[in-house]
Amino acid sequence: IPVIEPSVPELVVKPGATVTLRCVGNGSVEWDGPPSPHWTLYSDGSSSILSTNNATFQNTGTYRCTEPGDPLGGSAAIHLYVKDPARPWNVLAQEVVVFEDQDALLPCLLTDPVLEAGVSLVRVRGRPLMRHTNYSFSPWHGFTIHRAKFIQSQDYQCSALMGGRKVMSISIRLKVQKVIPGPPALTLVPAELVRIRGEAAQIVCSASSVDVNFDVFLQHNNTKLAIPQQSDFHNNRYQKVLTLNLDQVDFQHAGNYSCVASNVQGKHSTSMFFRVVESAYLNLSSEQNLIQEVTVGEGLNLKVMVEAYPGLQGFNWTYLGPFSDHQPEPKLANATTKDTYRHTFTLSLPRLKPSEAGRYSFLARNPGGWRALTFELTLRYPPEVSVIWTFINGSGTLLCAASGYPQPNVTWLQCSGHTDRCDEAQVLQVWDDPYPEVLSQEPFHKVTVQSLLTVETLEHNQTYECRAHNSVGSGSWAFIPISAGAHTHPPDEFLFTP
């Protein structure tokens, strides 16, 4: 660590005095302190001498000696007071610039340590400090306003009591700068724009920041636009706004528009796309299949996406049949706007009833005309089964009718014993009917099929079961002959159990 001669922490001299401060180190040493007049600096081997033969109050300050080659960076310091009865203060700065919540040091150095007891800090023209101003004083360094706030950006003076009267320093301007968290905040309105050729359009690019020092510009397809800037200050933020007004748009105005703002922290940009079209348009689409199949009792949401300019003048959902005259309840129709030109319309159909199968159409209208999108809704049903005994061409026949959607498949089972449903252990015989006869098959209705099982003799103590299944579920009907020799009796002599 370098050594200073004289080896005292502080030195008090009178104006006009000669002051010689010598610093000695192991290697080369250098003096540092506030740049000020009348000092001479010279080196003498491993020492450096700072001297003046005419000290003034302006030489009051702390002088530090360092050894640049010292890896530990050791230093020594001495504080010099040049005690001028006419000048109690040496002010080292005209202005102090700090960021909010930093300590602000106002460098009023007392030229006479004896005056410390009577010092105070005031605002210029004798005005008191703002409330909640927390400050401290050091004769070597000056007044420190702790955790300075933007509102404390003022002109200050240091005051000392000399012979019963207050003597003021020259003023120091404190500038407390807002901490800039990042590049300016940006808005570009609208986020998307569509206009018909010849219409008017407006694009507004605005940026705001806590600090006034930022730039903003609007560019079209990488060309910077010359637009007059409007500036404002509100909510403690500076705002700069660029407004592009186009009276009659044409195709050359279309394209990408970027709003770009920058400050010392960096750059922000946001973009939008401007489409110019020849005429009004209205497009309907759906991400769903237009042919829908849903199990009865379940719910379905039908969704239509609409792209339109100008905006819609009307829209509605319509039930086109075939079952009833009912129309969708308005409360089940929902509209959401994705953005200015794209909307989603949803029709909610909860707990679907058989009478609600059929065609649903979404209709929309704008100056470009009418458009419609139609969904076909078919309900799925599990099979319903019934079996009867009859004679066909003189042969005893079991006739199974199965109704459901999608079309059911039919399987016959013969099993031992009387049972509501054959289980694997009881099954004696199984017949699959790959091609049952279709009795009815209309759009949006169940499909009814019929399967015949010719039985020469109905075995008593056995059960005949018709099973039908489709993708929704299955159904069955068990036929139980009551007495032997049934084949000779008409069907009404037999009981059958569903």
Epitope: E30, P35, S36
Partner: antibody, heavy 117, light 110 residues
Framework: QVQLQESGPGLVKPSETLSLTCTVS????????WSWIRQPAGKGLEWIGR???????NYNPSLKSRVTMSVDTSKNQFSLKLTSVTAADTAVYYC???????????WGQGTLVTVSS | QSVLTQPPSASGTPGQRVTISCSGS????????VNWYQQLPGTAPKLLIY???QRPSGVPDRFSGSKSGTSASLAISGLQSEDEADYYC???????????FGGGTKLTVL
């Protein structure tokens, strides 16, 4: 050995604000005085002002109304802002460490700022 | 118009001694020390002399400075071609409360 490097836009429009930053490397910015000096093409040097690491500043009276300097010790940087620029502010701008008898050592390499529309 | 006055140009042949003058007033050179800077073409100024006559390490002893009253001078002995540069004097000015520069002298080595 401490090194200094100026950075900032090379072109500024008239009436706008010139903003430059000086980054100090291979040494600490703390407890020293740092200055900005400029030199118009083919002309002499002009001291703009100095800043201490506590934020204390002194400016050349001829530029005082337009100048603000600030320091960010956490980034080892100090900066210059000069408002309402005109073509007369076109110059190479240098940052430098100012020593006790007001000599400058070392200097940054300088950055040319042109004021033009 | 610079506060300190320097001749705009000076010249000399290799090996010669040249002197560049710098004139001021009582508020600058008269009461404060003088510093000199060398600016080689296309580069930043470099400290050559501080406190009237002190040379930073690395500056050849061919360069020397002196001060008398309100004037100062820079002497370069044994002139070399690499000395061709602009030279600026500077001093603290009490009325400005900051440093002032001379207009610079362009030294040509013939």
């Amino acid at each position: 050995q401490v090194q200094l490097q100026e950075s900032g836009p090379g072109l500024v429009k008239p009436s706008e604000t010139l903003s430059l930053t000086c980054t100090v490397s291979d040494g600490s910015i703390s407890s020293y005085y740092w200055s900005w000096i400029r030199q118009p093409a083919g002309k002499g040097l002009e001291w703009i002002g100095r800043i201490y690491t506590s934020g204390s500043t002194n400016y050349n009276p001829s530029l005082k109304s337009r100048v603000t300097m600030s320091v960010d010790t956490s980034k080892n940087q100090f900066s210059l802002k000069l408002t309402s620029v005109t073509a007369a502010d076109t110059a190479v701008y240098y940052c430098a460490r100012e020593r006790i008898t007001s000599f400058f050592d070392p200097w940054g390499q300088g950055t040319l700022v042109t004021v033009s529309s | 118009q610079s506060v300190l006055t320097q001749p705009p140009s000076a010249s000399g042949t290799p090996g010669q001694r040249v002197t560049i003058s710098c004139s001021g007033s009582s508020s600058n050179i008269g009461s404060n020390t003088v510093n000199w800077y060398q600016q080689l073409p296309g580069t930043a100024p470099k400290l050559l002399i501080y406190s009237n006559n002190q040379r930073p390490s690395g500056v050849p002893d061919r360069f020397s400075g002196s001060k008398s009253g309100t004037s100062a001078s820079l002497a370069i002995s044994g002139l070399q071609s690499e000395d061709e540069a602009d030279y600026y004097c500077a001093a603290w000015d009490d009325s400005l409360n900051g440093p002032v520069f001379g207009g610079g002298t362009k030294l040509t080595v013939l």
